[in-house]
Interface confidence: low
């Protein structure tokens, strides 16, 4: 069941084919639910758009690394 009361489980069914510039990214979440077909990363852009990405791709790992190193802690 969801971990929060009435919280939906967010899943990614397809990944973006395009590399996204880190300057456009605000934050990320790493989705690991067994209720989802794929392990995924959801990037949130500076204009609040959410994009599904493949955590096995190097640009995705580099982008997460970049966001980790930022001192601020934006809420997704």
């Amino acid at each position: 069941q969801p971990d929060a009361i009435n919280a939906p489980v967010t899943c990614c069914y397809n990944f973006t084919n395009r590399k996204i510039s880190v300057q456009r990214l605000a934050s990320y979440r790493r989705i690991t639910s067994s209720k989802c077909p794929k392990e995924a990363v959801i990037f949130k852009t500076i204009v609040a758009k959410e994009i599904c990405a493949d955590p096995k791709q190097k640009w995705v790992q580099d982008s997460m690394d970049h966001l980790d190193k930022q001192t601020q802690t934006p809420k997704t």
């Epitope: 971990d3 790493r30 790992q61 690394d65 001192t71």
Partner: antibody, heavy 115, light 111 residues
């Protein structure tokens, strides 16, 4: 639900393998956390859900501890060169919908290292 | 390493009272990935709060999590005898070096 097994009394320098069994056919990420008697919690390692089986270890656990997925419902923790400092209750825990917290824990299994 | 400093180590309060537990991270916790767990003797920990302030399923609403960055707080109001337990904070930091850090624990005694 989750259940650990394999805890035992072993001598220093010995090896031991613990098993975590999940009741469902699939699970989220499974992590191992230990707790020495009367002490706090200490993260050891995690293994990814799905077919990728990505593994993540605490820096102190690398090399001596190995986490593996042995079936669709079981995850093991292999421990080598055990010392008295490894005496603890070992818990397996399932992550939530994100990787960052543990929403379900097993009851734990006790490992005692003593000569 | 991600080090979580939890205070106080022990606190006592009366039924109906309020307890506040603080947790300070050695580095900023990304996306406020802070959780709080309750543990009773002989039992495994139980998730109370995740992502700093989200209440886990089945957890009573008198538990409240707050904070961001490096400073986080668990507040237990309208204290009940069943709340007597040890509470742990736990932070998660970074993709490149996945790491969980647990606080040292706070024992809550209900009078």
């Amino acid at each position: 639900s989750l259940e650990e097994s394999g805890g035992d009394l072993v001598k220093p320098g010995a090896s031991l393998t613990l098993t975590c069994t999940a009741s469902e056919l699939d699970f989220y990420w499974i992590c191992w956390v230990r707790q020495a008697p009367g002490k706090g919690l200490e993260w050891i390692a995690c293994i990814g859900a799905g077919s990728s089986g990505s593994t993540y270890y605490a820096s102190w656990a690398k090399g001596r501890f190995t986490v593996s997925k042995t079936s669709s419902t079981t995850v093991t923790l292999q421990m080598t060169s055990l010392t008295a400092a490894d005496t603890a209750t070992y818990f397996c825990a399932r992550t939530g919908t994100e990787f960052t917290y543990y929403s379900l824990w097993g009851p734990g299994t006790l490992v005692t290292v003593s000569s | 390493a991600l080090v979580m400093t939890q205070t106080p180590s022990s606190v006592s309060a009366a039924v109906g009272g309020t307890v506040t537990i603080n947790c300070q991270a050695s580095q900023s916790v990304y996306n406020n990935n802070m959780a709080w767990y309750q543990q009773k003797p002989g039992q495994p920990p139980k998730l109370l709060i995740y992502t700093a302030s989200s209440l886990a399923s089945g957890v009573p609403s008198h538990f409240r999590g707050s904070g961001s960055g490096t400073q986080f707080t668990l507040t237990i109001s309208d204290l009940e005898s069943d709340d007597a337990a040890t509470y742990y904070c736990a932070g998660y930091k970074s993709y490149s070096n996945d790491e969980y850090g647990f606080g040292g624990g706070t024992e809550v005694v209900v009078k």
